[in-house]
Interface confidence: low
């Protein structure tokens, strides 16, 4: 006869090792008994359990409550023990010895692979503000055994690199993914992806990106010179910018204080019917966490009265 | 379905110091990473600190220094020490954790008030 077992057995953690010893005898021959044991451990084999044929199942004292025989219908010939609730010191090597009538002993080894999926983390890196050169946007740990493979998906155009700490048991691969920020990039999703044959599918955590921002500001509403005219009613001046977070205006009026009757509202500044004490220079000034913009204008309420022309001059400062 | 009840909010004067503790229910499946986040009045909510299975941890700029995260992996539970409050820690303080299953799922608990007088 002879006994078929299997060179590894892999599972997962947390799961149930069957661990298969089936003896193929020839007609009339019996299985008395057999022994499994630990065949790695430092100090000689370590017994897990003895199935028995007539006393039925021993199991060490190490082991209780760990090992069982596999659920009826059994054959007599099967010696398969199944290791409840594997961990990852259960990992390696096992011996499946068998004593048999009347042909005498043999014993085979198997390798016991624990697999032990990933938890990855994502922890996003400092602050991004356009204008800064390549910076962290997120490093993505994932510790497991085996090594676990880390990999990032985005359309988002960057650098990526890893690195990996081995244990006793497991390794872990951190990897980091550098990017220059640009206003583009925000809200666009940075997704880690660990990859495991532990697991049944890749395991995906998405960080959105935010990068601070703040664009030139500029002023709309001069664009015709002609409707800035004395008694002219509805008109107005818009602050024009974008930003991340978003932005607020402030309007004030540089040779002066605003003149009465015009309303700030929030990027607008409104007038009443106009009047020549609305002429001057407006000033639009823009900001948020990130930073501040300036942009003014020249007012110039034209009289029809007299004979001058209407001057606008448009100036940006950041 | 995993329930976060935070706890350890309150009062303190600047300079003083709170505990904030968070308790996740038993679940079959190991919280992956479970931390803090804060919302002032009339602001976004915000990154506090976050704590890995395995014990890493991660903080933001504002705090980093002054508050210290810990967890105790057995009963799912996260806690912030905050040493050294300022006015600007004032908001409520949110935990959060992710369960890892064949995908993350984040939960969040409904919040507890840390104020800082000056």
């Known amino acids: 006869g002879e006994l078929e077992t299997s060179d590894v057995v892999t599972v997962v953690l947390g799961q149930d090792a069957k661990l298969p010893c089936f003896y193929r005898g020839d007609s009339g021959e019996q299985v008395g008994q057999v022994a499994w044991a630990r065949a790695d451990a430092g100090e000689g084999a370590q017994e897990l359990a003895l199935l028995h044929s007539k006393y039925g199942l021993h199991v060490s004292p190490a082991y209780e409550g760990r090992v069982e025989q596999p659920p009826p219908p059994r054959n007599p010939l099967d010696g398969s023990v199944l290791l409840r609730n594997a961990v990852q010191a259960d990992e390696g090597e096992y011996e499946c010895r068998v004593s048999t009538f009347p042909a005498g002993s043999f014993q085979a080894r198997l390798r016991l692979r624990v697999l032990v999926p990933p938890l990855p983390s994502l922890n996003p890196g400092p602050a991004l503000e356009e204008g800064q050169g390549l910076t962290l946007a997120a490093s993505c740990t994932a510790e497991g055994s085996p090594a676990p493979s880390v990999t990032w998906d985005t359309e988002v155009k960057g650098t990526t690199s890893s690195r990996s700490f081995k244990h006793s048991r497991s390794a872990a691969v951190t990897s980091e993914f550098h990017l220059v920020p640009s206003r583009s990039m925000n809200g666009q999703p940075l997704t880690c992806v660990v990859s495991h044959p532990g697991l049944l599918q890749d395991q995906r955590i998405t960080h959105i990106l935010h990068v601070s921002f703040l664009a030139e500001a500029s002023v709309r509403g001069l664009e015709d010179q002609n409707l800035w005219h004395v008694g002219r009613e509805g008109a107005m001046l818009k602050c024009l910018s974008e930003g991340q977070p978003p932005p607020s205006y402030n309007w004030t009026r540089l040779d002066g204080p605003l003149p009465s009757g015009v309303r700030v509202d929030g990027d607008t500044l409104g007038f009443p019917p106009l009047t020549t004490e609305h002429s001057g220079i407006y000033v639009c000034h823009v900001s948020n966490e990130f930073s501040s913009r300036d942009s003014q204008v020249t007012v110039d309420v034209l009289d029809p009265q007299e004979d001058s022309g209407k001057q606008v001059d448009l100036v940006s400062a950041s | 379905e995993v329930q976060l009840v935070e706890s350890g909010g309150g009062l303190v004067q600047a300079g003083g110091s709170l505990r904030l503790s968070c308790a996740a229910s038993r679940s079959t499946f190991s919280l992956n990473i479970m931390g803090w986040y804060r919302q002032a009045p009339g602001k976004q909510r915000e990154y506090v600190a976050t704590i890995t299975t395995g014990g890493s941890t991660n903080y933001a700029d504002s705090v980093r220094g002054r508050f210290t995260i810990s967890r105790d992996n057995a009963e799912d539970t996260v806690y912030l020490q905050m040493n050294s409050l300022k006015p600007e820690d004032t908001a409520v303080y949110y935990c959060?954790?992710?369960?890892?299953?064949?995908?993350?799922?984040?939960?969040w608990g409904r919040g507890t008030q840390v104020t800082v007088s000056s």
């Open positions: 959060t954790a992710e369960l890892v299953r064949r995908g993350p799922t984040t939960y």
